[in-house]
Interface confidence: low
Amino acid sequence: TIPPHVQKSVNNDMIVTDNNGAVKFPQLCKFCDVRFSTCDNQKSCMSNCSITSICEKPQEVCVAVWRKNDENITLETVCHDPKLPYHDFILEDAASPKCIMKEKKKPGETFFMCSCSSDECNDNIIFSEEYNTSNPDLLLVIFQ
């Protein structure tokens, strides 16, 4: 992914579309890679990542990965293509407007991951149980 201050050179009128043909431009995501975090035992946390990046590819979405082991807690924020696995997991919730954390099985640590497709949506990561049920907000048709 290209940092925000680097201008990309793309021909005018080059357009990228999704499977439906809807116009798609790259979105903005928090992109700090792996940072130590104080986020623990909270319903939601802010990423505290000051870097907002334009994702390199139009199909990329925002991802956050929260990991806790005996030594520390880290939060990873990136752009990633939902067609490809991340940390060996499929991004099942890539169309969600919010980053709703779901626990994944990883030996030796507690591992949560979320993905979402609205600008900087991985800045606010949500652990609250109430969002993990069939929240109507998540049923909105989201397109880019």
Epitope: V10, T17, F25, D119, V141, Q144
Partner: antibody, heavy 121, light 107 residues
Framework: QVQLVESGGGLVQPGGSLRLSCAVS????????MSWVRQAPGKGLEWVSS????????HNTDSVKGRFSISRDNSKNTLYLQMNSLRAEDTAVYFC??????????????WGQGTLVTVSS | DIQMTQSPSSLSASVGDRVTITCRAS??????LNWYQQKPGKAPKLLIY???SLQSGVPSRFSGSGSGTDFTLTISSLQPEDFATYYC?????????FGQGTKVEIK
């Protein structure tokens, strides 16, 4: 509150040029795709052009390709439409609008008040 | 390009009436359908996005339904400020296209 204010419209002869501007306030301009939509007198709405949040990608309707160019200056919170080789059929009110093709929901909202472009000899 | 056809092109109604406007796409557009209201000399205003989601600040008397090719905008009880022209717009494919408009006039 969110405001989009267009300027630069006026009377121009066929073959002439105009540059429209849209000054934006009330939201983080650099984070959103922007578009131009036009409306000929007494007619319906027609999408003209869109530009991505960073300004690196643009898309135009076929009838203006090679003649119109959309651009933006994120440091000035301003959207532009450079219109060259103007034709009588380009006569319309030109609206700038936030959205379309940005992340999130694919619609135009909000809109500016519009600026009238009249192409006539 | 996808053609959007609205009907009727105009209608007369009274305050308190239930008003229905339809929009038909020339091919399936899933739920990629938005509705706008425009008053004379003013900019369009988004009412409904994604076929049925009410935009923030829009009165609940406005509702949208449909998917595929056939869509409906309903005003459950017409108010004086609702007399305007209404447009549908598809965002399923490029270029995004609008219906020709439906003018709602006072009877």
């Amino acid at each position: 509150q969110v405001q989009l204010v267009e300027s630069g419209g006026g009377l121009v002869q066929p073959g002439g040029s105009l540059r429209l501007s849209c000054a934006v306030s009330g939201f983080k301009f650099r984070r959103y795709a922007m578009s131009w939509v036009r409306q000929a007198p007494g007619k319906g709405l027609e999408w003209v052009s869109s530009i991505s949040a960073s300004g690196d990608r643009t898309h135009n309707t076929d009838s203006v390709k090679g003649r119109f160019s959309i651009s933006r200056d994120n440091s000035k919170n301003t959207l532009y439409l450079q219109m060259n080789s103007l034709r009588a059929e380009d006569t319309a009110v030109y609206f700038c609008a936030k959205g379309l093709a940005a992340s999130g929901k694919n619609y135009f909202d909000p809109w500016g008040q519009g600026t009238l472009v009249t192409v006539s000899s | 390009d996808i053609q959007m056809t609205q009907s009727p092109s105009s209608l007369s109604a009274s305050v308190g009436d239930r008003v229905t406007i339809t929009c038909r796409a020339s091919q399936s557009i899933s739920s990629y359908l938005n509705w706008y209201q425009q008053k004379p000399g003013k900019a369009p205003k988004l009412l409904i996005y994604a076929a049925s989601s009410l935009q923030s600040g829009v009165p609940s008397r406005f509702s949208g339904s449909g998917s595929g090719t056939d869509f409906t905008l309903t005003i459950s009880s017409l108010q004086p400020e609702d007399f305007a022209t209404y447009y549908c717009q598809q965002s399923y494919s490029t270029p995004p296209t609008f219906g020709q408009g439906t003018k709602v006039e006072i009877k």
